[in-house]
């Protein structure tokens, strides 16, 4: 029998190198039953996640799972940071892992990075 | 169940580069985190570096000072190593390794490959 | 890195005793998700690695209930209440909390 929890589906430490400037789409997959759960994104402040108000958010309906998507548009140097989405269901707060955003500044980067040196070395990115 | 099978040569020459592939069956590869780890004969483990398949994100330990590379075929639903200038030091069992992303609910090795280096 | 010291180094059991294994991390393995990602492996002669123990009191499907983990912060204990003779391995933890992940360098549970 298959649970009928919510379920957000962000792996732990997961990351993405993004561009300033350029558009980018953060997703949040929700696995939920019969009612989908009211769901919102927070960029975090030290230990705290600060619940990000008035930006455009949108739903994604596929097969077997729903995305919750925080659009960045286009993206800033200051959007580098870890988000988490979290979902209201039945009264309890279901929070996903938090996935960060690595964002390389093209102003300040002599050449745009390929994806691979990107992805394999995040620490010389923008932070 | 999910498995994980290591394929590749068991000899490498010094200077050369040592290619690994592991192919998982019973989960698909993008839920998971897929890792490399390595065993000396007779001694610990040392963990290599691992990737997101969903996206090709992925991480390393310094301490293999970019030699090694890690990539990852959905389509396949496999991943692949490949450790470059390699010495007698790196010979090793190479083990791949996958576990869920999400709620790290399993956590399962393939049954490793003697790599030994030597002309 | 983060460093695992594990102890002792060959721990030497008959069957049917208690086996206590210490693990102690050089840095608090508490993540910012509040959990604490403290495995612990066996291995026996020949075969590939096994996790018994996540988030340092998990047990994985089908490990016995005569293995627990315990814990927090830089201390960790694995104990088999009672040890069988299929139990004669090495055991090692690990951590998952940070990059670069790193294990202990293991304990031997040998036949006393």
């Known amino acids: 029998k298959e649970s009928c929890d919510v379920q957000l589906y962000i792996k732990r430490q997961s990351y993405h190198s993004i561009f300033a400037g350029d558009p980018f789409k953060l997703e949040c997959p929700v696995k939920y039953c019969a009612h989908r759960p009211q769901v919102t994104w927070c960029k975090l402040n030290g230990t705290t996640c600060v619940k990000l108000e008035g930006r455009h958010t949108s739903w994604k309906q596929e097969k077997n799972l729903s995305f919750f998507i925080l659009h960045f548009e286009p993206v800033l140097p200051s959007d580098n940071g870890s988000y988490r989405c979290s979902a209201n269901f039945l009264s309890a707060i279901i929070e996903s892992h938090s996935t960060t955003l690595y964002v390389t500044d093209v102003k300040s980067a002599s050449e745009r990075p390929s994806k691979d040196e990107m992805a394999s070395r995040p620490w010389l990115l923008y932070s | 169940q999910v498995q994980l099978q290591e394929s590749g040569p068991g000899l490498v020459k010094p200077s050369g580069t040592l290619s690994l592939t592991c192919a998982a069956s019973g989960v698909n590869i993008k839920d998971t985190y897929m890792y490399w780890v390595r065993q000396p004969p007779g001694k610990g483990l040392e963990w290599i570096g691992r990737?997101?398949?969903?996206?090709?994100?992925?991480r390393y330990n310094p301490s293999f000072k970019s030699r090694a590379t890690i990539s990852a075929d959905k389509s396949k639903n496999q991943a692949s190593l490949k450790l470059s200038s390699v010495t007698a030091a790196d010979t090793a069992v190479y083990y791949c390794?996958?576990?869920?992303?999400?709620?790290?609910?399993?956590?399962?090795w393939g049954q490793g490959t003697l790599v030994t280096v030597s002309s | 890195e983060i460093v695992l010291t594990q102890s002792p180094g060959t721990l030497s059991v008959s069957p049917g005793e208690r086996a206590t294994i210490s693990c102690r991390s050089s840095?608090?393995?508490?993540?910012?998700?509040?959990?604490?990602?403290l495995n612990w492996l066996q291995q026996k002669p020949g075969q590939a690695p096994r996790r018994l123990i996540y988030l340092v009191s998990k047990r994985d499907t089908g490990v016995p209930d005569r293995f627990s983990g315990s814990g927090s912060g830089t201390d960790f204990t694995l104990t088999i209440s009672r040890v069988e003779p299929e139990d004669f391995a090495v055991y090692y933890c690990w951590q998952g909390t940070l990059f670069p992940r790193t294990f202990g360098q293991g304990t031997k549970l040998e036949i006393k």
């Open positions: 390794a996958v576990y869920d992303g999400y709620y790290e609910s399993f956590d399962v």
């Open positions: 840095q608090s393995l508490l993540d910012s998700d509040g959990k604490t990602y």
């Open positions: 990737i997101d398949p969903a996206n090709g994100y992925t």
